[in-house]
C-alpha cells in the first residue's frame, strides 16, 4: 500500500479517529518510556489512551502498525486488516499486557477529548458529513477522509447542504475532493472551494471517498454534504453520473469516473 | 528566513496588566508551538507556559497559572501573553521561543525579548 | 519538577584548554539540550537531543550524558565561546532550565 496524507490507499487505515492518534518521539520508533508517553498526550491536551478508546478507534478503521503504551502502562496497537508483517495475522488490539516495567520504550497511543474530530468509515444509508466545528468556521491544517461503502448493488446519492470554503483560483489552499472510489488516488470526481453549492453527484457503484483539506491561513464557514443510498434501478431512471463541470472555482477540476 | 519579532519595553504599575506581543515571521505560524520564558535580572531562565496556535490550547507552568493568560491570533501569526496583578517580582525579561511539537522538545528560535519594568 | 543542577556555576579557561561542564538531573530524562546566552541578548539553541548540534555551532562543541547525568564539552576553547550555558529538559511537565555555567576566559 501506498502512504499518503494519514491514509494507506487501497484501505481503510486512518491515523486518527475517534479521538485517538499516534506518537513517536522525534528520534523514532520505540523510544519513550511509560512517563514520557504519558508526558507527550497531556502536553497535546490528552492523555494516554484507554484499551477501550483505542479498540473504539480501531472499528471505524484506526490501524497503525506500532506498539504504544496505553493508559495504566498497558502496551499494544490496533490492526483493522491482517497482514504477514504485522498482527501475526491477527485483527483487533495486539495486546502486550500491562508491563512490569515502566521504564521499557514503546511509541504513545494518545486520546483527545477536544479533538475536533472528522472523518471515517461509513456504512450507514443515510449519513451528513460536516467540516469540524460546523457551523462554526474550520481550523487551519485540517485534513479528513470520509469513507463511504454501502451494500452491493447500492450507489450512493451525494447533495451539498452548505459549502463555504476560502476561494482560491485553483482550489489550492481550501478544498473538498470527491472519489467515486474507496481511496483518494482513483476514481477522482472534482475538487470543490468557494462558496456556491455544488451541484449533486451520484456515485457508479457502493462506494465513495471524500476528502477535505485546509491549509495553514485563511478559513471560512465550512461545509454540509449529505448521502443517501440509492436502491438499484432500472438504467432508464438513473441519476447523472457525473460531476459538475461549472467554471470557476467551485470545481477546480472534474475527472471522469473510473469504475470499480 | 524565521523571525520573532517582540513588542517593545514596558513600563508598569503593581496591580496593573500588561499584553506582550510576540509576531512570527518566515514559518507557517499553525505548524509550530509558541512558548514564553522568564528571566529576572542577573538569573536564569524559567519556562512559563506555550499555546499550541492551531488549536488554541495553551498550558502554563503552575506558578504561573494565574499570572499569565497566553493568546494567539492566526490571522497576524502573532502569539500574546497578558501578564495580570503585576508585582515588582514580575520585572524581567520576557522571550518568546517556538518549539516544533515534537518530542522531547526544545525550541529552536527566540524573540529578542521584552523588558517589563514594574514601579510604582 | 525535574530539578536540573549545573555545575560549576562560573568556571574559566585559557585559550585552547578543554573545557568540561555538567548537568544533573533530579529525575532521569532520555534527552538534554544546551543553550548559549550571551550579555543582553536571547539564548541560542546550542545542542539538541543530547549531542547534535545546532546550526552554526562549531564542531569543538560535544555533548554527551544519559539518564541523570549529562554534559557538554568543548574541545579547545576559544573567546568567541565566552557566554553563560544552560541545560533545559524538554521531556517532563514542567519544562525546565538549569541554573546555568557562567564561562569566561582566562
Known amino acids: 500500500w501506498g502512504f499518503k496524507d494519514g491514509i494507506f490507499h487501497n484501505s481503510i487505515w486512518l491515523e486518527r479517529a475517534a479521538g485517538v492518534y499516534h506518537r513517536e518521539a522525534r528520534s523514532g520508533k520505540y523510544k519513550l518510556t511509560y512517563a514520557e508517553a504519558k508526558a507527550v498526550c497531556e502536553f497535546e491536551g490528552g492523555h494516554l489512551a484507554t484499551y477501550k478508546q483505542l479498540e473504539a478507534a480501531r472499528k471505524i478503521g484506526f490501524h497503525v502498525c506500532a506498539a504504544g503504551w496505553m493508559a495504566k502502562g498497558r502496551v499494544g496497537y490496533p490492526i483493522v486488516k491482517p497482514g504477514p508483517n504485522c498482527g501475526f495475522g491477527k485483527t483487533g488490539i495486539i495486546d502486550y499486557g500491562i508491563r512490569l516495567n515502566r521504564s521499557e520504550r514503546w511509541d504513545a497511543y494518545c486520546y483527545n477529548p477536544h479533538a475536533k474530530e472528522c472523518g471515517g468509515v461509513f456504512t450507514d444509508p443515510k449519513q451528513i458529513f460536516k467540516s469540524p466545528g460546523f457551523p462554526n468556521e474550520y481550523e487551519d491544517n485540517q485534513i479528513c477522509y470520509w469513507h463511504i461503502r454501502l451494500k452491493y448493488g447500492q450507489r450512493i446519492h451525494l447533495s451539498f447542504l452548505d459549502f463555504d470554503l476560502e476561494d482560491d483560483p485553483g482550489c489550492l489552499a481550501d478544498y473538498v475532493e470527491i472519489y467515486d472510489s474507496y481511496d483518494d488516488v482513483h476514481g477522482f470526481v472534482g475538487r470543490y472551494c468557494g462558496d456556491e453549492l455544488p451541484d449533486d453527484i451520484i456515485s457508479t457503484g457502493n462506494v465513495m471517498t471524500l476528502k477535505f483539506l485546509s491549509d495553514a491561513s485563511v478559513t471560512a464557514g465550512g461545509f454540509q454534504i449529505k448521502y443517501v443510498a440509492m436502491d438499484p434501478v432500472s438504467k432508464s431512471s438513473q441519476g447523472k453520473n457525473t460531476s459538475t463541470t461549472s467554471t470557476g472555482n467551485k470545481n477546480f477540476l472534474a475527472g471522469r469516473f473510473s469504475h470499480l | 528566513q524565521v523571525r520573532l519579532q517582540q513588542s517593545g519595553a514596558e513600563l508598569a504599575k503593581p496591580g496593573a496588566s500588561v499584553k506582550l506581543s510576540c509576531k512570527a515571521s518566515g514559518y507557517t505560524f499553525t505548524s509550530y508551538w509558541m512558548h514564553w520564558v522568564k528571566q529576572r535580572p542577573g538569573q536564569g531562565l524559567e519556562w512559563i507556559g506555550y499555546?499550541?496556535?492551531?488549536?488554541?490550547?495553551?498550558k502554563n507552568k503552575q506558578n504561573f497559572k494565574d499570572k499569565a493568560t497566553l493568546t494567539a491570533d492566526k490571522s497576524s501569526s502573532t502569539a500574546y501573553m497578558q501578564l495580570s496583578n503585576l508585582t515588582y517580582e514580575d520585572s524581567a525579561v520576557y522571550s518568546c521561543?517556538?518549539?516544533?511539537?515534537?518530542?522531547?522538545?526544545?525550541?529552536?528560535?527566540w524573540g529578542q525579548g521584552t523588558t517589563l519594568t514594574v514601579s510604582s | 519538577e525535574n530539578v536540573l543542577t549545573q555545575s560549576p556555576a562560573i568556571m574559566s579557561a585559557s585559550p585552547g584548554e578543554k573545557v568540561t561542564m555538567t548537568c544533573s538531573a533530579s529525575?532521569?530524562?532520555?534527552?538534554m539540550h544546551w543553550y548559549q546566552q550571551k550579555s543582553s541578548t536571547s539564548p541560542k539553541l546550542w545542542i539538541y537531543?543530547?549531542?547534535k548540534l545546532a546550526s552554526g555551532v562549531p564542531g569543538r562543541f560535544s555533548g554527551s550524558g544519559s539518564g541523570n547525568s549529562y554534559s557538554l564539552t568543548i574541545s579547545s576553547m576559544e573567546a568567541e565561546d565566552v557566554a553563560t550555558y544552560y541545560c533545559f529538559q524538554g521531556s517532563g511537565y514542567p519544562l525546565t532550565f538549569g541554573s546555568g555555567t557562567k564561562l569566561e576566559i582566562k
Open positions: 537531543d543530547t549531542s
Open positions: 521561543a517556538r518549539s516544533d511539537g515534537s518530542y522531547p522538545y526544545y525550541f529552536d528560535y
Open positions: 529525575s532521569s530524562v532520555s534527552y
Open positions: 499555546i499550541i496556535p492551531s488549536s488554541g490550547y495553551t
